[in-house]
């Protein structure tokens, strides 16, 4: 139960969390315009990773979008890479974990192919989550750093008489969107992982005891009720009564000292 | 078409109060600010104010030392400016105007005259 | 506040001539978010409200005559009629739309010589 939970709860942070990576690239609002310097500014400059947009104080708002691939910035193209990145893994990540899920029923899946498949699709949220909080803090670092940089030539102008205010830049809300996603992201990925190592059983050292009496065969695997917590793929935790030497549900016997015949 | 009406001349005592109406018809007057700008006789134009009506965002020239008052009535789609504290140099066409694209004023009401005289 | 000087005060000018009013603004109007300049020209004739003329410091309003241009970026300013006509009879406005308070030119009388 407690598996299942962890691994449904997984999934849903996950699903927010990519969403809230797909808004946040689609989001206008990567760097606004500073206004400390210029608080009464009847004309507001955002960007984002696609489009830069101007809202007047009238209430009109133009955005043009960025029409030239090579003429942008290598790291402007980077963080579009690493977002991109970050929601085809997710997506990616979703669609398998949705196979994976213990709740849902897919003809006669094995438990061991859902975990497989848990420990996927979690590796691709982690990773997905990565991208995206590498992605924002790269955009992040580079308003940093061309801030400052403005900053140190605020104002230009003929002998102080006439001011050209340059317009700098600073966090806007996509930033703070990206970066709790890529943390959701990642959380919702680490839950599917520990939910993997629960959906798996572990590997015994002691493999099944044939005990041949007359009439039938009954083998007894020892320690059918085990707890599902190592990564191994048999999740099928019953006692098998199949009057055989090995025991139906073992999917890979490795030769042990400790094996019993 | 576009149209802002001005209610009519005043004429005020130092110290005494004003409040200029301006009806607006023509457009979705909710979705636009509303400007207040006066001209004093033979003088320029001087901003005084706006408001949105839409949710009564105001913003005020400070030279008017919270003097003025920008109100609007949605239902009756009408702006106005109020003025208090009266003084002689108030004496000006007081002018309604529409915010445009480019941050400009494409119509105007027709002006209202306040004379402040004791 | 930004301050808008306009020059010169007044300004005659024979019919079908060219009359230039220039426009100084003590900060610079130019939006480096869409390379636009926020300065408005208006014109005014006696006993009306100012008209629209040009916004965007070149974009003409509607209805406005294409003998009305608008020139100029950053500080300096021109607005230019290439053939006064007897209705350019007005003064002429120049208004700072990029910082409140919005602040205008104190104006230029165009007169027929």
């Known amino acids: 139960m407690a598996v299942t939970a962890c691994q449904g709860l997984g999934f849903v942070v996950s699903l927010i969390g990519i969403a809230g990576i797909i808004a946040a690239t689609c989001m206008d609002q990567w760097s606004t315009q500073d206004l400390y310097n210029n608080p009464v500014t009847a004309v507001f400059n955002y960007q984002g990773l696609w489009r830069s947009c101007v809202r007047e104080s009238s209430g009109f708002t133009e955005c043009r979008g960025y029409f030239t691939l090579l003429g942008l910035p290598a790291m402007l193209q980077a963080v579009r890479a690493l977002m991109i990145v970050g929601i085809v893994l997710g997506a990616i990540g979703l669609l398998v974990s949705i196979f994976a899920l213990k709740c849902i029923r897919i003809g006669s899946m094995e438990d061991s192919a859902k975990a497989n498949m848990t420990l996927t699709s979690g590796i691709m949220f982690i990773v997905s989550g990565l991208c995206a909080i590498a992605g924002v803090s790269v955009f992040a670092n580079m308003l940093v750093t061309n801030f400052w940089m403005s900053t140190a030539n605020m104002y230009t102008g003929m002998g102080g008489m006439v001011q050209t205010v340059q317009t700098r830049y600073t966090f806007g809300a996509a930033l703070f969107v990206g970066w709790v996603a890529g943390g959701l992201t990642l959380i919702g990925g680490v839950m599917m992982c520990i939910a993997c190592r629960g959906l798996a059983p572990e590997e015994t050292n002691y493999k099944a005891v044939s005990y041949h009496a007359s009439g039938h065969s009954v083998a007894y695997k020892p320690g059918g009720f085990k707890a599902s917590t190592g990564f191994g793929s048999n999740t099928k935790n019953k006692k098998i009564y199949d009057g055989g030497a090995r025991t139906e549900d073992e999917v890979q016997s490795y030769p042990s000292k400790h094996d019993y015949v | 078409q576009v149209q802002l009406v001005q209610s009519g001349a005043e004429v005020k005592k130092p110290g005494a109060s004003v409040k200029v109406s301006c009806k607006a018809s023509?457009?979705?007057?909710?979705?636009?600010?509303m400007n207040w700008v006066r001209q004093a006789p033979g003088q320029g134009l001087e901003w005084i104010g706006q408001?949105?009506?839409?949710?009564?965002?105001?913003k005020y020239n400070g030279n008017f030392k919270g003097r003025v008052t920008i109100t609007a009535d949605t239902s009756a789609s009408t702006a106005y400016m109020e003025l208090s504290s009266l003084r002689s140099e108030d004496t000006a066409v007081y002018f309604c105007?529409?915010?445009?694209?480019?941050?400009?004023?494409?119509?105007w009401g027709q002006g209202t005259l306040v004379t402040v005289s004791s | 506040d930004i301050v808008m000087t306009q020059s010169p005060d007044s300004l005659a000018v024979s019919l079908g001539e060219r009359a230039t009013i220039n426009c100084k603004s003590s900060?610079?109007?130019?939006?480096?978010?869409?390379?636009?300049?926020?300065l408005t020209w208006y014109q005014q004739k006696p006993g009306q409200p100012p008209k629209l003329l040009i916004y965007?410091?070149?974009t003409r309003d509607s209805g406005v005559p294409d003998r009305f241009s608008g020139s100029g970026s950053g500080t300096d300013f021109t607005l230019t009629i290439s053939s006064l006509q007897a209705e350019d009879v007005a003064v002429y406005y120049c208004?700072?739309?990029?910082?409140?308070?919005?602040?205008f030119g104190g104006g230029t009388k165009v007169e027929i010589k």
């Open positions: 965007w410091a070149s």
């Open positions: 408001i949105y009506p839409g949710n009564g965002d105001t």
């Open positions: 900060q610079s109007l130019l939006n480096s978010g869409n390379q636009k300049n926020y």
């Open positions: 023509g457009y979705a007057f909710s979705n636009y600010w």
């Open positions: 105007a529409r915010y445009y694209r480019g941050n400009c004023f494409d119509y």
């Open positions: 208004q700072n739309a990029y910082t409140y308070p919005l602040t």
